[in-house]
């Protein structure tokens, strides 16, 4: 039986999130380290089958850059209720049996019920904020001694640009059962029979504590004579770069199109191609 | 100063081939989302074909879907447009794009003088 914790994450995220944008976070334990402007990893999987795995490494944004800045502004989203109810039960039976001869018969049952209700919102990165933040800051000068390990061990290392949190603590109970029954009977000058029964019952309950990230949205950072983040993703797309050479740096003017609250920075690529 | 140069335009036969280049320079060449467009007499410019800033991801317009392959090499700082299998109705004026692939680079786009491609027998 799978992670209460899991499932739930992964019944908010399929509700909310159609265009498979969100992260999904894998332990409890780690949901508290996945906040706006936070630095992760992409750790590759060891299997085709399971996706990758993204790690904190307890690295803020600001911490990479100079002069100090303050703490990024995030905007908060609106609230969404979500309530998921499940109760299922399976059973059949089978008997066997020869005209006077053996019989077995034998039967079983599995049933499994959950139900959950938690307020989720959205904490996001205002583009706005990006720009301002990246044209006010530079990289810090020496990088920081973890962005040198991340480049020495070719990391791609991506920045939080949007939590799904919870609003307030939530418990979850999974309640999972099992029962079997079996007998026999054998015919003949000692007639043997036998009877068997059984049942399995287990409960998990979980406590998710208020502001527990559920699921999270990134962009690849891209650090060469600078910090800059990707807007769109690119699989072939590495963090840390050779600085170009003969080429200014590109600095941009004005302030970020604004897009509808909601919308991924990811999404505003059709607008740059068909302007 | 930013430049987008395209080259390789000429007359083909119909089913014939052709590689058109378009070489940047003055801007990190690597943090833009290059793309290829093209205008025929009396239409609206078309987009064509769309590569990510490293080359991982590429979109294409249905019409060229299976034809026409977009690939980059950034250590040259060039974007390319290999069209097969032309066909009339790709008579244009192909034109290169440069759209900032960051967000340093967001609010800049430039744009080549563009290269005549005509199919016709």
């Known amino acids: 039986m799978g992670s209460a914790f899991e499932r739930v994450v992964r019944r908010v995220v399929q509700e909310l999130d159609h265009g498979g944008e969100f992260i999904p976070v894998t332990s409890l334990q780690s949901s508290t380290g996945f906040q706006p402007y936070c630095l992760v990893v992409r750790k590759p999987s060891s299997s085709w089958f399971w996706k990758p795995r993204y790690k904190c490494v307890n690295l803020s944004i600001k911490d990479i850059l100079e002069p100090d800045a303050a703490e990024p502004d995030v905007q908060r989203g609106r609230s969404f209720h979500f309530y998921d109810a499940m109760d299922g039960q399976i059973q059949g039976s089978v008997e066997l049996a020869a005209p006077g001869q053996a019989k077995i018969a034998g039967g079983a049952a599995v049933s499994d019920s959950s139900s959950t209700s938690m307020n989720v919102y959205s904490l996001s990165v205002d583009p706005n904020t990006w720009q301002t933040l990246l044209h006010e800051a530079h990289l810090r000068q020496p990088e920081h001694a973890v962005l040198q390990q991340l480049a020495s061990a070719g990391d791609n290392v991506y920045v939080v640009t949007e939590v799904l949190q919870t609003q307030k603590e939530v418990e979850v109970t999974r309640t999972h059962k099992r029962e079997g029954s079996g007998r026999f009977s054998l015919p003949g000058a000692t007639c043997l029979q036998g009877e068997g029964q059984g049942h399995l019952s287990q409960k998990k309950t979980v406590t998710i504590p208020s502001g527990s990230t559920l699921a999270f949205r990134v962009a690849q950072l891209v650090i060469d004579s600078d910090l800059d983040v990707l807007l769109f993703p690119d699989k072939k797309q590495r963090t840390f770069q050779p600085p170009a050479t003969g080429h200014k740096r590109s600095t941009s003017e004005g302030a970020w199109p604004q897009l509808p609250s909601g919308l991924s920075m990811m999404r505003c690529l059709h607008n740059f191609l068909t302007d | 100063q930013v430049q987008l140069v395209e080259s390789g335009g000429a007359l083909v036969q119909p089913g014939g081939s052709l590689r058109l280049s378009c070489s940047a320079s003055?801007?990190?060449?690597?943090?833009?989302?290059m793309s290829w467009y093209r205008q025929a007499p009396g239409k609206e410019r078309e987009l064509v074909a769309t590569?990510?800033?490293?080359?991982?991801?590429?979109n294409y317009a249905d019409s060229v879907k299976g034809r026409f392959t977009i690939s980059r090499d950034n250590a040259k700082n060039t974007v390319y447009l290999q069209m097969n299998s032309l066909k009339p109705e790709d008579t244009a004026v192909y034109y290169c794009?440069?759209?900032?692939?960051?967000?340093?680079?967001?609010?800049?786009?430039?744009w080549g003088q563009g290269t005549q491609v005509t199919v016709s027998s």
């Open positions: 590569i990510t800033t490293a080359g991982g991801n590429t």
């Open positions: 794009k440069a759209s900032g692939g960051t967000i340093r680079t967001v609010n800049e786009t430039y």
């Open positions: 003055g801007f990190t060449f690597s943090k833009y989302l």
